[in-house]
Interface confidence: low
Amino acid sequence: TGADTEAVVCVGTACYTAHSGKLSAAEAQNHCNQNGGNLATVKSKEEAQHVQRVLAQLLRREAALTARMSKFWIGLQREKGKCLDPSLPLKGFSWVGGGEDTPYSNWHKELRNSCISKRCVSLLLDLSQPLLPSRLPKWSEGPCGSPGSPGSNIEGFVCKFSFKGMCRPLALGGPGQVTYTTPFQTTSSSLEAVPFASAANVACGEGDKDETQSHYFLCKEKAPDVFDWGSSGPLCVSPKYGCNFNNGGCHQDCFEGGDGSFLCGCRPGFRLLDDLVTCASRNPCSSSPCRGGATCVLGPHGKNYTCRCPQGYQLDSSQLDCVDVDECQDSPCAQECVNTPGGFRCECWVGYEPGGPGEGACQDVDECALGRSPCAQGCTNTDGSFHCSCEEGYVLAGEDGTQCQDVDECVGPGGPLCDSLCFNTQGSFHCGCLPGWVLAPNGVSCTMGPVSLGPPSGPPDEEDKGEKEGSTVPRAATASPTRGPEGTPKATPTTSRPSLSSDAPITSAPLKMLAPSGSPGVWREPSIHHATAASGPQEPAGGDSSVATQNNDGTDGQK
């Protein structure tokens, strides 16, 4: 579907056009581009009101709009692969015509992060609400649409065309019709300001073909920043009406002569311009020579002026425009300084937070503070960082080095630690013996005892648990689970062998095969059933079947 220009508003040095038509953002941008513009920017509250006005004009004529919510594309987009930046007003979006990251924004709701596809912004109009200045259209972001599928509720788009300057509308001193044709191919008979290079066709008369006179004018740059039609005196004047029709086309005063002729004049403090119609203030500030937020300040006796900038800005070389002062040049911050329009802000490096003596100071974040520690066990705060440590019998684990994993002394590298059975426990281990053997006083060796079919020498009670006596581990069959949250037993160990817990008697294996052969320090592994000693079924930390999952608190232990 095509797009119709339904409305136009020209103000300052720009014109905004509103179009109805269900187009994708790319098609809408292409439509604006064909006429020398772009999808509209909304860089300030003032510009938002201009856009609101042109949409109001469009909606006034668009009786067919039945949707309660309507969306109109503007020129704010985020390319595929570019992620959301919540710290910026534009959230990582940028204006299609280029330009800086502007401070004004009016988002409809909090944005969700998605870097996968291109995202485009539309103005969301609630047609059930009056278009009041305090109720500016909200910004809604979403997919950019595609030909034939423009996007949900997309009703149209707004273009912006920028110009060197504007001419005043032509004033008629008698009956007639003015038709303006703009460089962006819009025709209108009523514009508040008419853009440079527009043509004006004036047809004088009251419709009688015989009486109709036509005039053609072009809005030209007469002098730097001075634009006019090159016409002189009111148009379509008629002795029949004199000053009675539209004030004779005069901007301020109209003076009639006795013969039906008349002249335009100006009030005190104003002067008549070369077009003999328009009055301009003798006050040099009235032409708004200052730009970019600069305020015009009259000199003595109102003869000349100077431009003054708001705090955080300074005059540029033209002495007419304000540019941002980069306060960060003076290093006002202890760590990072971010220049912003009209000011700056101090930021702290990762591991520091605002605080301490002086403006913009930063102080170390104590990551180890109570209730804040990212470490599973020991935590040591350092300047701008921290490191984790583990109790004896545990080693640091996890991608971020904040978790502690039990050392399984029964399966580690090195020589045998127990002569026979090895039982791993949380943070420790102990040795055991097969039925018919008993643990020697050294807690490692096994000595022959009375033959029994009872359980092997199982793990002692918690309070009897001995200290670890070394780091070597025998090649005995063991289960070495990782530590679960709070050390609580969970699920079965990850080993594929059947577990032999401390309270389960060995009944499934033939006794002759379990009996030690030769030295009691050697246990020949049975060829059929694999007996495994474990301290109890447990699951890796993190609650799933993977080993030592990373905690998700964003810390990496190393900043």
Epitope: K45, L59, P130, L132, P133, S134
Partner: antibody
């Protein structure tokens, strides 16, 4: 010249409805919003709602929502305001007034007012 | 709703003297550099008549002895030299937010 002319005075019983008219002349009817404002004896002026004559969009003061209906007849350049479920406190002078389309919607032209009396 | 409070309720001023009426909004009625505050004059048996729009702009045909000032929440209507025909009730109105609301009115009389 620009003029708004309202219908004549009305006397109604509580619970009834009243429909007032406002005929515009001297300007393009569809280029301005039409508002209704009322003034009860000794009370401040109270905005009731507005209509865009070109598209018939209506916006109401929530206080009257459900009781007030504003309509237009473009061909007759006339706006209407109907107020239902009348109560004694609806006794007031009702004015129609026009405003520009966008921005500061001040009321630059007013009708002379219609007196509505609600009494049992 | 934005509540508009006018003071004083009534004012008696000698002919040729200055009359000042105040209007206070419960929240700012400014937007984009403009104040959405208007003043109306109402004479007995007549509809209100627009005097000032956007806080300080004189409606065409209104005598220049009437002037308006203020921004944000505080506004003033001034009659520089009171004339007999200025005896009326004056109302302020905000048009920045729905519902559009009016002040309670200030009655101006001749002393």
């Amino acid at each position: 010249q620009v003029q708004l002319v309202e219908s004549g005075a009305e006397v109604k019983k509580p619970g009834a409805s009243v429909k007032l008219s406002c005929k515009a002349s001297g300007y393009t009817f569809t280029s301005y919003w039409m508002h209704w404002v009322r003034q009860a004896p000794g009370q401040r002026l109270e905005w009731m709602g507005e209509i865009d004559p070109s598209a018939s969009y209506t916006y109401y003061n929530q206080k009257f929502k459900g009781r007030v209906t504003i309509t237009v007849d473009k061909s007759a350049s006339t706006a209407y305001m109907e107020l239902s479920s009348l109560r004694s406190e609806d006794t007031a002078v009702y004015y129609c007034a026009r405003s520009v389309y966008y921005g500061n919607k001040y009321f630059d032209v007013w009708g002379p007012g219609t007196t509505v009396t609600v009494s049992s | 709703d934005i509540v508009m409070t006018q003071s004083p309720d009534s004012l008696a001023v000698s002919l040729g003297e200055r009359a000042t009426i105040n209007c206070k909004a419960s929240q700012s009625v400014d937007y984009a550099g403009d104040s959405y505050l208007n003043w109306y004059q109402q004479k007995p048996g007549q509809p209100p008549k627009l005097l000032i729009y956007a806080a300080s702009n004189l409606e065409s045909g209104v005598p220049d002895r009437f002037s308006g000032s203020g921004s944000g929440t505080d506004f003033t209507l001034t009659i520089s030299s009171l004339q007999a025909e200025d005896v009326a009730v004056y109302y302020c109105q905000q048009t920045n937010e729905d519902p559009r609301t009016f002040g309670g009115g200030t009655k101006v009389e001749i002393k």
